[in-house]
């Protein structure tokens, strides 16, 4: 004998307490295969999740994640903080560093740049929003003759790119 | 059509713990199935269930703390992945009965399992 | 996560009595009407009264009434016997993958 459940289309449900009829799926709740007695419960994209696909009687909701997070796992199980090198997450998102500091990293947030002069050095390469300043030795260390007691020479500022 | 659970023992904190639920007259692919805990002296806890095909929903608070599986057609299981003191409780598995036809878990809880006893104890 | 406030306990009336359980849900329950009531007595598993709100659960007598909509829900014991000291739960379903049903805290019921 055939099962009278076979025969109930995904959408639906075979119901146990009805004499086995076939009765569409409630709101927010799904079957994607034929013949099944139960329907599932529609995933729901809440807090950094978005909602990529809309649950419909057949088919799950499919989720990915806000900006400044990135999809893990089978079928975005998870999200993860992911910015771009030279952002910061904020909570509206992924933001570019501010002048003045930087991240090389895609994940964390924005750190100053060093500032060579506390070091008593120059700065040899300038920052950037992605990567430091590169800090080189002083003036002075770079004069012919120049010994250890030699007075540090007024370092500049820190430079900068355009952002 | 009966319910009953078993596997619940003493148990160190952090050591996993699986507790088995056994159907009898019924089959798990035809019902969803929850299961509940009662800590002493506290009330009911809802901690999650499974659907007909298998799809697993946990409370907010027992997800990642727990996993429902369905090994066979009659028989499913609810793992405690690090218990602490505060798992300490009864667990009690129960079908749903979905008297009312919605065709997905409704809180019709009928029949439930005796429970079993989980002591969590250093 | 919706939360479900029941009568304090415990609630006390003599046998023959009548006594009444409410259950107050902060959000509406799926459909208006998706919420059950349960038995629990000490060293036994609970019990199904009433599911959908009014439906009396098979084997259940009919002293026990379930009624309500949406948020607010009541369980009605009338002709009180003794075998009815227990604590009764009302449970919430709502449209949500995660905190799918919500548990209310309990309300203890002491026949004199």
């Known amino acids: 004998l055939q099962d009278p459940c076979s025969n109930c289309p995904a959408g639906t449900f075979c119901d146990n307490n009805r004499n086995q009829i076939c009765s569409p799926c409630p709101p927010n709740s799904f079957s994607s295969a034929g013949g099944q007695r139960t329907c599932d419960i529609c995933r729901q994209c809440k807090g950094v999740f978005r909602t990529r696909k809309e649950c419909s009687s057949t088919s799950n909701a499919e989720c990915d994640c806000v900006p400044g997070f990135r999809c893990l796992g089978a079928g975005c199980a998870m999200c993860e903080e992911y910015c771009q090198q030279g952002q910061e997450l904020t909570q509206k998102g992924c933001k570019d560093c501010c002048f003045g500091t930087f991240n090389d990293q895609k994940r964390g947030i924005c750190r100053p740049w060093t500032n060579c002069s506390l070091d008593g050095k120059s700065v040899l390469v300038n920052g950037t929003k992605e990567r430091d300043v590169v800090c080189g030795p002083s003036p002075a260390d770079l004069s012919p003759g120049a010994s250890s007691v030699t007075p540090p020479a007024p370092a500049r500022e820190p430079g900068h790119s355009p952002q | 059509q009966s319910v009953e659970e078993s596997g619940g023992r003493l148990v160190t904190p952090g050591t996993p713990l699986t507790l088995t639920c056994t159907v009898s007259g019924f089959s798990l692919s035809d019902y969803y199935m929850t299961w509940v805990r009662q800590a002493p002296g506290k009330g009911l806890e809802y901690i999650g269930i499974?659907?007909?095909?298998?799809?697993t929903y946990y409370a907010s608070w027992a997800k990642g703390r727990f996993t429902i599986s369905k090994t066979s057609s009659t028989t499913l299981e609810l793992k405690i992945t690090s218990p602490t003191t505060e798992d300490t409780a009864i667990y009690f598995c129960?079908?749903?009965?979905?008297?009312?036809?919605?065709?997905?878990?409704?809180?019709?809880?009928?029949?439930w399992g005796p429970g079993t006893l989980v002591t969590v104890s250093s | 996560a919706a939360v479900l406030t029941q009568t304090p306990s415990p609630v006390s009336a003599a046998v023959g009595g009548t006594v009444t359980i409410s259950c107050q849900a902060s959000?509406?329950?799926?459909?208006?009407?998706?919420l059950s009531w349960f038995q629990k007595k000490p060293g036994q598993p609970p019990k199904l009264l009433i599911y959908?709100?009014?439906s009396l659960a098979s084997g259940v007598p009919s002293r026990f009434k379930g009624s309500g909509s949406g948020t607010q829900f009541t369980l009605t014991i009338s002709d009180l016997e003794s075998d009815d000291a227990a604590t009764y739960y009302c449970t919430g379903r709502y449209n949500s993958d995660t905190d799918t049903f919500v548990f209310g805290g309990g309300t203890e019921v002491v026949v004199k």
């Open positions: 959000q509406s329950v799926v459909g208006n009407s998706l």
């Open positions: 129960a079908r749903d009965g979905d008297y009312a036809g919605w065709g997905y878990a409704t809180g019709a809880f009928d029949p």
């Open positions: 499974m659907s007909g095909s298998g799809s």
């Open positions: 959908s709100a009014s």
